[in-house]
């Protein structure tokens, strides 16, 4: 440890490099300055991401993994720091950058949207479920007519290239479908998607985007919705959707539509049954939808409504006379 009267001069790290290690993923590496004295003190490093999005954090080790988009380039700095209770000593910054890839910005795709969905696996010998991925995009406004686009996704350590594309009238790929992926339904990692392109006439700027799974996961509708009327009680039941999440992880909305007077009742529930008091003169259609609750992951998308179930009377019953 430093003595109170001891002076220390901090030197910046050396050999600072940025290496692309995967789709939308870089590794920052550096070495302690070999001329740094007082090696026995607990030196730390402050890492600052300058672009594409500002961030900074501290670390004791001499490397750092970063998940980030790269189509705008990437720039970072690192410096040596020494902290105690009262003050912070810091060296000057060492900096490095990756330039934006070639191609004018107008050649890259725009409006990339992706959704994931869980489906039963037809190939599996066991009853198991797969996560599919569907992405769509628009052709860049400055992209030559012969441009062809190619999509890749990375989830964790797996990177896959799209094999099933949809095309526009010029034969350019504008959507991609992965029936099976290595994406985890319950995963907390970012999904990275890259669309690059090629043309004989000009360089096509790649475009990459990070997606949080909870924000793009299209939940399946609830299963086996049933509704029955006993007197003035409408009893509705259903089962949880096909999903990796267990039964306690779902919020539901029940929609009861009185087709006679148009009245619409929507109830939010955490259970898989609901009883409503109704009149016995009307016909009703009933639908249920689901979402993963915030107890189990960050709020996301609601499922589509289940197919409507019709209950109640078709005929217009005369009012009872006393």
């Amino acid at each position: 440890d430093l003595l109170p009267d001891e002076k220390i001069s901090l030197l910046p790290p050396v050999n600072f490099t940025i290496k692309v290690t995967g789709l939308a993923q870089v590794l920052l590496q550096w070495k302690p300055n070999p001329d740094q004295e007082q090696r026995n003190v607990n030196l730390e490093y402050q890492v600052k991401i300058n672009a594409p999005k500002e961030d900074d954090y501290e670390t004791r080790i001499t490397e750092s993994k970063c998940v980030t988009i790269l189509h705008k380039g990437f720039s970072a700095s690192v410096r040596t720091i020494l902290q105690n209770d009262h003050s912070l000593l810091a060296s000057s910054w060492a900096s490095a950058e990756l330039h934006a890839p070639p191609g004018s910005p107008g050649t890259s795709i725009v409006n990339l949207t992706c959704t994931t969905n869980t489906t039963e696996d037809n190939y599996s010998r066991l009853r198991s479920y797969q996560v599919s991925l569907h992405c769509t995009w628009l052709v860049g406004t400055d992209a030559p007519e012969d441009t062809q686009y190619f999509l890749y996704y990375r989830y964790g350590s797996w990177t896959e290239e799209c094999q099933e594309y949809s095309k526009d009238t010029l034969g350019r790929n504008i959507a991609c479908w992965f029936p099976r992926t290595f994406i985890l339904s319950k995963g907390r990692d970012w999904l990275a998607v890259l669309v690059n392109g090629s043309s004989k006439h000009s360089a096509i700027r790649p475009f990459d985007q990070l997606f949080a799974l909870h924000a793009i996961d299209q939940i399946n509708p609830p299963l086996n919705v049933t509704a029955e009327i006993e007197g003035t009680r409408l009893s509705i039941q259903w089962e949880k959707p096909v999903s990796a999440f267990p039964i306690h992880c779902f919020d539901y909305e029940v929609k009861i539509h009185n087709t006679r007077n148009g009245y619409l009742q929507i109830e939010k529930l955490m259970t898989n049954a609901f009883i409503s008091i109704i009149d016995d003169l009307s016909k009703y259609d009933v639908q249920v939808r689901a979402a993963v609750s915030s107890m189990c992951r960050e709020a996301g998308l609601w499922s589509e409504w289940s197919q409507p179930i019709y209950v109640g009377n078709d005929e217009h019953k005369p009012l009872r006379e006393w």
Epitope: R125, T181, L184, K186
Partner: antibody, heavy 121, light 112 residues
């Protein structure tokens, strides 16, 4: 029924190379991701590598990254593991297994009987 | 040192119930990732015993069951039989590791 048959194991000197093969039958090989898992003598299971159904995407354990290469020939229903720069700690029984997933979490539903690789001078 | 921790050995008499634990962390079992169990009889290849926490492939007796809570999982075997003597391994997914596949160190079950 599913059958996986490994071959190619044997005795090799440190720094040497070996190529393992796994012949698959009884299922549509090209629909499945595949994997290699090893077990050192008297020790537990260690996942080594995996490859997607089309053969274009691969994954490795840190302990073999840069030394081992997984590949497949769907026309021949065969999985391969090219092992270079072998070390004594690579000595193990190497199993070929399908790399199935449920909601994305991998598991190994079918296994071969294994082939022994011994790295020793 | 395995990422998932299992007791090296357990033993019980025929007919008894035995449980084998598998302890993980927030980056694997604690994140809700499924746990799978394998049985390896002496001198043979491993065999999938339980997948997705508690599902049995066809042919696996219902004496075997799996459960999970927090950062741990358990394999329970009831009505223990001599042929259950084997090594048992848990396996899951770990988001912090390259390749993501993680095994427990294995548990040797001895039927007394």
């Amino acid at each position: 029924q599913v059958q996986l048959q490994e071959s190619g194991g044997g005795l090799v000197q440190p720094g040497g190379s070996l190529r393992l093969s796994c012949a698959a039958s009884g299922f549509t090989f090209s629909n499945y991701a595949m994997s290699w898992v090893r077990q050192a003598p008297g020790k537990g299971l260690e996942w080594v590598s995996a490859i997607n159904s089309g053969g274009k995407s691969t994954n490795y354990a840190d302990s073999v990254k840069g030394r081992f290469t997984i590949s497949r020939d769907n026309a021949k229903n065969t999985l391969y593991l090219q092992m270079n720069s072998l070390r004594a700690e690579d000595t193990a029984v190497y199993y070929c297994a399908d790399y199935a997933t449920n909601y994305g979490v991998p598991y190994f539903g079918s296994w071969g009987q294994g082939t022994m690789v011994t790295v020793s001078s | 040192q395995s990422v998932l921790t299992q007791p090296p050995s357990v033993s019980a008499a025929p007919g008894q119930r035995v449980t084998i634990s598998c302890s993980g962390s927030r980056s694997n079992i604690g994140s809700g990732y499924d746990v799978h169990w394998y049985q390896q009889l002496p001198g043979t290849a491993p065999k999938l015993l339980i997948y997705d926490d508690n599902n049995r492939p066809s042919g696996v007796p219902d004496r075997f069951s799996g459960s999970k809570s927090g950062t741990s999982a358990s394999l329970a075997i009831t009505g223990l039989q001599a042929e259950d003597e084997a090594d048992y391994y848990c396996q899951s997914y770990d988001s912090s590791l390259s390749g993501h596949v993680v095994f427990g160190g294995g548990t040797k079950l001895t039927v007394l």
